[in-house]
Amino acid sequence: TQHGIRLPLRSGLGGAPLGLRLPRETDEEPEEPGRRGSFVEMVDNLRGKSGQGYYVEMTVGSPPQTLNILVDTGSSNFAVGAAPHPFLHRYYQRQLSSTYRDLRKGVYVPYTQGKWEGELGTDLVSIPHGPNVTVRANIAAITESDKFFINGSNWEGILGLAYAEIARPDDSLEPFFDSLVKQTHVPNLFSLQLCGAGFPLNQSEVLASVGGSMIIGGIDHSLYTGSLWYTPIRREWYYEVIIVRVEINGQDLKMDCKEYNYDKSIVDSGTTNLRLPKKVFEAAVKSIKAASSTEKFPDGFWLGEQLVCWQAGTTPWNIFPVISLYLMGEVTNQSFRITILPQQYLRPVEDVATSQDDCYKFAISQSSTGTVMGAVIMEGFYVVFDRARKRIGFAVSACHVHDEFRTAAVEGPFVTLDMEDCGYNIPQTDESTLMTGRA
């Protein structure tokens, strides 16, 4: 899932110390087994590094081998490094696991840039800072890769949390979360709070910091403020949703809403940027440029290539607009909007300028495969992947970066007609043509 561009992580701003973060249940949550109770053990279980993804600690095999695994809602394979690689500190050693079973089947996953390939098997898997369960899951043991692992990222594998339809080599390979729900009493739901730093972190700061939380099987109310608003999952492959309107500083982009979802719109923790279809990207950039016209930035900045630097502490957040995405609501003709700040879509970049400077990359980019609501969006919000009810919830994250004047927001309801028309129907093609890596 676009492993080249990922967003920065941060200690949980605004969160209480671990022991004080007790979840509060409200009557808005259904009373399902396992849904109630404390998720304290899962709070703050993610780490990460600027632009390189959020990872959770997992154990594989018997005796357990500990690995850091990238949390990716934009793919569906559990795949781990299983051979020496210059960028890996450690890797899964199948021969040391008494519970490993070989499926005698290979898997090859090409990305737009790069690829990985490996051998399929199953083994026992658990998440130390997750539910107290162990499951037998499919594992792709990566034996060869190109431009997949990232030097210094500190993760050794990927946990694809999307649906079986996009699993490789085909949809018969059960994804990890499906196995977890089938084999345990964990409810069919997980939630993510990704905490962007707002400033770059060096390696030691990352290892000592908190990157956020993956709550498996429930919702932790300490991780968000306000209400959760839900949008339907349009189709269970990626986490596909429908955007019905886009505003820049309250100004409607006034495009046919089908354009916003051409050819799909997905929520993807494994992609850094907010990625927009070409026409939408061009209109959005034009509008953002107009809103910030007191300053002029180089062409390469808007392409996400050049960095713009300000003297430390003087970044003029106020000249950059807020961006609102309206999502289809659960009720007919009702939508809600999520609003992000420049603190989310300007990504701090480390090790470039002097300590006297704060440097940023523009983290909105062009896509040829639809809208990707990557970490740029997710870092503003607590995102609930309610698979059981086929919906995704958004609430303002307790750790999002903001300033004294503006904050990220989730607001509704708004009346929006004919929202079903906003979805794009992808022509049926041979499944082998499905593109991985979302260029």
Epitope: K296, P298, Q306, D351
Partner: antibody, heavy 120, light 108 residues
Framework: QLQLQESGPGLVKPSETLSLTCTVS??????????WGWIRQPPGKGLEWIGS???????WYNPSLKSRVTISVDTSKNQFSLKLSSVTAADTAVYYC????????????WGRGTLVTVSS | EIVLTQSPATLSLSPGERATLSCRAS??????LAWYQQKPGQAPRLLIY???KRATGIPARFSGSGSGTDFTLTISSLEPEDFAVYYC??????????FGGGTKVEIK
């Protein structure tokens, strides 16, 4: 054809303020496609960026000079100016004004430069 | 801070020879690098931008290559008017402010 011409005193006393003006001819300083900048070069040494300005008056300065530099623009006169306060002998240099073009990134057009000597 | 190191400091060549000038960045600057030529008593002149694109009016004997951290300016066959000082500049971080120390191309 657009041209840039620096003007100002060639001699400034230590602790005083150096003031230079760049006049743009053959084109408009109000173009949205360009920034305008000042670069200096001490005798026998390399190039040092001082700062840049946009038509709106938005400025960017070299952090090492920021506390002493002011760059301003006068669109009615098609000019932009440099003021450098509290000068010392280390500020003796040829001062160039330049246009920042090619995607607002490169100094694609330069003035001829003017030598400013700081001496009592 | 990104530091640009140019080498050699001086290059002694004869007219008609090929000149190869190097500019190394302390970290990647993608392709956001320019080359300028400065003759004695004159202002610098933009030769190459975006690492390999020739500026308007620059002869074809000047070419730029490289990306990331290593860049090269090549003058395929030196003309008498090419003997000058050459500077590289990175604009990966903006505003544009970092120049290399320069390479002097002199007549042998």
């Amino acid at each position: 054809q657009l041209q840039l011409q620096e003007s100002g005193p060639g001699l400034v006393k230590p602790s005083e303020t150096l003031s230079l003006t760049c006049t743009v001819s053959g084109g408009s300083i109000s173009s949205s496609s360009y920034y305008w900048g000042w670069i200096r070069q001490p005798p026998g040494k390399g190039l040092e960026w001082i700062g840049s300005i946009y038509r709106s008056g938005s400025t960017w300065y070299n952090p090492s000079l920021k506390s002493r530099v002011t760059i301003s623009v006068d669109t009615s006169k098609n000019q932009f100016s440099l003021k450098l306060s509290s000068v010392t002998a280390a500020d003796t240099a040829v001062y160039y004004c330049a246009r920042v073009g090619h995607g607002i990134s490169y100094f694609d057009l330069w003035g001829r430069g003017t030598l400013v000597t700081v001496s009592s | 801070e990104i530091v640009l190191t140019q080498s050699p400091a001086t290059l002694s060549l004869s007219p008609g020879e090929r000149a190869t000038l190097s500019c190394r960045a302390s970290q990647s600057v993608s392709s956001y690098l320019a080359w300028y030529q400065q003759k004695p008593g004159q202002a610098p002149r933009l030769l190459i931008y975006d690492a390999s694109k020739r500026a308007t009016g620059i002869p074809a004997r000047f070419s730029g290559s490289g990306s990331g951290t290593d860049f090269t300016l090549t003058i395929s066959s030196l003309e008498p008017e090419d003997f000058a000082v050459y500077y590289c500049q990175q604009v990966y971080t903006w505003p544009p402010r970092t120049f290399g120390g320069g390479t002097k191309v002199e007549i042998k």
